[in-house]
Amino acid sequence: AESCTSRPHITVVEGEPFYLKHCSCSLAHEIETTTKSWYKSSGSQEHVELNPRSSSRIALHDCVLEFWPVELNDTGSYFFQMKNYTQKWKLNVIRRNKHSCFTERQVTSKIVEVKKFFQITCENSYYQTLVNSTSLYKNCKKLLLENNKNPTIKKNAEFEDQGYYSCVHFLHHNGKLFNITKTFNITIVEDRSNIVPVLLGPKLNHVAVELGKNVRLNCSALLNEEDVIYWMFGEENGSDPNIHEEKEMRIMTPEGKWHASKVLRIENIGESNLNVLYNCTVASTGGTDTKSFILVRKADMADIPGHVFTR
């Protein structure tokens, strides 16, 4: 069954067929003998009952009030009444944009990631039996598609697919031609799911230290939730009892990615800790990134250009 008109506030464009369907339709069929009435109120007019004689543009069928077509003066409040059931809608009819094939107020925006599945399907189940043909336009230029009853686009999105897609259904009623437009604003964006992880700061860091003292080497990265960050040093990690990997800290960024940092703590620095590489690596499905730290005795600092030092 076609969805009933559940939203209490509706905006429609002048000149298009339109319908209101109340939401107790199944109930109404059960109580065939019950009086069912449609009313309109607008401005000074209070609850005027609607019937086919009210206007040649209005039709009543079972659960539905139809407009052929809806016009600006149809703006107002509409009521359906049956026994102790009432449903109310506030209808706002707006002007058609004469300079475009669609009206901006009637746009549905969708964002699609590049290379992900993207579809536009031109369907209108309520008017389906009356539709002669349907055309699909992109940025108001007609697309030549095989099916002129329900034109469809189904593909993996490319950046060139971005634009305004308008489905225009052409239908006949009582010898007159009408059309109904449904427009989608499609924006194609980069893959939002994963980033290439990156280590923050220079790739090579010389750290000035004193023998017998302690040092903390901080490795920070911007990464995805499933990515890992780890330290590598010496022949075998963990062979030096003075070297400790601290617990990894993670903070979520506003974009849903992670800022991670992992500290390597070297206590009681000895000669064996100098001039060797302490490598920090971030690894993901998309690859790895590594940065290196070298401990240098303070006395030897003069031999190395100043810009390569970190503290």
């Epitope: 209490p8 339709c25 107020r105 604003n185």
Partner: antibody, heavy 121, light 111 residues
Framework: QVQLVQSGAEVKKPGASVKVSCKAS????????MHWVRQAPGQGLEWMGT????????YYNQKFQGRVTMTRDTSTSTVYMELSSLRSEDTAVYYC??????????????WGQGTTVTVSS | EIVLTQSPGTLSLSPGERATLSCRAS??????????MHWYQQKPGQAPRLLIY???NLETGIPDRFSGSGSGTDFTLTISRLEPEDFAVYYC?????????FGQGTKLEIK
């Protein structure tokens, strides 16, 4: 007229997943977009994402990308929101809510009663 | 992403007074004469309730002491004469573009 009825409260351990359901009243399901909004204790409202039940199109807030999945079952007029890799900061009340599909109509005039999800070890 | 900033964070007033709540968007949420900004009221333990849609339209069943105004980036929710039941948290929300977003809220408390 539309009513949204959500599943009951959940208690989960960190790292687990939770799946919350939201059933819409008859006849209205495919014509409205469904959204999920959460509210941590004492905090504001946070929009998580949306699903268009007519074609299953989804769009998620980047903050939840990769952890959240929204699905629908048109036969039962139900939408689902699954959140994985739960952390303590995911403890919140999760609301489903409905809007029109036009951009201008994406305001929330009907809300579910809320589902409390507690993440605790 | 459009960021909404509400001010003040907390507003202390007495019943009968006029309340003015502000919401500023990081970019325009208006187009072709419509402003895609909406306002909600939330009381403790309850789901939010729509008050105003499209900047200035009063939701059905909401008292007419509530009104909304503004366009572009600056919007205002006004409660002309505060009733005891109006003390709650108020949120603005934009639908100009995805992702949809809410302001951080303004708490309206009794002075």
């Amino acid at each position: 007229q539309v009513q949204l009825v959500q599943s009951g409260a959940e208690v989960k351990k960190p790292g687990a997943s939770v799946k919350v359901s939201c059933k819409a009243s008859d006849y209205t399901f495919t014509s409205n977009w469904m959204h999920w909004v959460r509210q941590a204790p004492g905090q504001g409202l946070e929009w998580m994402g949306t699903i268009d039940p007519s074609d299953s199109y989804t769009y998620y807030n980047q903050k939840f990308q990769g952890r959240v999945t929204m699905t629908r079952d048109t036969s039962t007029s139900t939408v689902y929101m699954e959140l994985s890799s739960l952390r303590s900061e995911d403890t919140a009340v999760y609301y489903c809510t409905t809007s029109g599909d036009y951009d201008a109509d994406r305001y929330f005039d009907v809300w579910g009663q809320g589902t409390t999800v507690t993440v605790s070890s | 992403e459009i960021v909404l900033t509400q001010s003040p964070g907390t507003l202390s007033l007495s019943p009968g007074e006029r309340a003015t709540l502000s919401c500023r968007a990081s970019k325009s949420v208006s187009t072709s004469g419509d402003s895609y900004m909406h306002w909600y009221q939330q009381k403790p333990g309850q789901a939010p309730r729509l008050l105003i849609y499209l900047a200035s339209n009063l939701e059905t069943g909401i008292p007419d002491r509530f009104s909304g105004s503004g366009s572009g980036t600056d919007f205002t929710l006004t409660i002309s004469r505060l009733e005891p039941e109006d003390f709650a948290v108020y949120y603005c929300q934009q639908s100009r573009e995805l992702p949809l977003s809410f302001g951080q809220g303004t708490k309206l408390e009794i002075k």
